[in-house]
């Protein structure tokens, strides 16, 4: 099937790199400066991604291949291909329609993007606060309130629960 | 044709102060924010300060907080940036950006090529 593509259609013995230039029969020519072809039998080269501006280039354009973009340090790539650069905030902030603002009271965000999430609420486990949430770190949880028996100390380990009826061994 | 122009750089002493401008043309100037950037030799290109359509700002570089200020004026389709106390670290090219919207650049966004602000101590 190959070979008889082939000699029905000269362009599929193009490589990746060149394209079948209709003004010159069919010729398999390079790609143009600033152009690629990342198949074979193309009959076109597309033109090479610019990273400008916000965007740095992350990999060069070269006859096969695109060229990839990432972000200018103080921005975040989204989308396929790192289509769009997001602004980054700090941590303890989540990006609004204004800009970045602080984590309200009650919700944290330890990174540079993304929104400010609920602290855990320890209670809903039986457990109680060991280290108070921050706007850039969640509540440590530590053992239930009726596990820290006068004197205990409330850093020490939760002895690992028992399965009903299982005697210590 | 869509073109946005820098201009109002130069050389200036350190704690001196210059005015650089952004002028836009070839699209809906009201419909855009306007971003400066700065790219200093050897160093990576870093956001200096966003205005947005509305004329909010956001600041990308804590650096500059108090010592440079945004603002457009529309009717002229130019945006400046105010800077007052530069210091030799503040030397760079200063280029404009037009996104829409001062937290989301894309592919499609128009870039000036930039302006050369050097400081000398």
């Known amino acids: 099937f190959e070979r008889t593509r082939s000699l029905q259609d000269p362009c599929s013995n193009c490589p990746a790199g060149t394209f079948c230039d209709n003004n010159r029969n069919q010729i398999c020519s390079p790609c143009p400066p600033n152009s690629f072809s990342s198949a074979g039998g193309q009959r076109t080269c597309d033109i090479c991604r610019q990273c400008k501006g916000v965007f740095r280039t992350r990999k060069e354009c070269s006859s096969t291949s695109n060229a990839e973009c990432d972000c200018t340090p103080g921005f975040h790539c989204l989308g396929a291909g790192c289509s769009m650069c997001e602004q980054d905030c700090k941590q303890g902030q989540e990006l609004t329609k204004k800009g970045c603002k602080d984590c309200c009271f009650g919700t944290f965000n330890d990174q540079k993007r993304g929104i400010c999430r609920p602290w855990t609420n320890c209670s809903l486990d039986g457990k109680s606060v060991l280290v108070n949430g921050t706007k850039e770190r969640d509540v440590v949880c530590g053992p239930s309130p009726a596990d820290l028996s006068p004197g205990a100390s409330s850093v020490t380990p939760p002895a690992p629960a028992r399965e009903p009826g299982h005697s210590p061994q | 044709q869509v073109q946005l122009q820098e201009s109002g750089g130069g050389l200036v002493q350190a704690g001196g102060s210059l005015r650089l401008s952004c002028a836009a043309s070839?699209?809906?100037?009201?419909?855009?924010?306007i971003g400066w950037f700065r790219q200093a030799p050897g160093k990576e290109r870093e956001g200096v300060l966003c205005?947005?359509?509305?004329?909010?700002?956001?600041y990308y570089a804590d650096s500059v907080k108090g010592r440079f200020t945004i603002s457009r004026d529309n009717a002229k389709n130019t945006v400046y940036l105010q800077m007052t106390n530069l210091k030799p670290e503040d030397t760079a090219v200063y280029l404009c950006g037009a996104p829409r919207d001062c937290s989301y650049y894309t592919s499609d966004d128009y870039w000036g090529q930039g302006t050369q602000v050097t400081v000398s101590s």
């Open positions: 070839g699209f809906t100037f009201d419909d855009y924010a």
């Open positions: 205005i947005s359509s509305s004329g909010g700002s956001t």
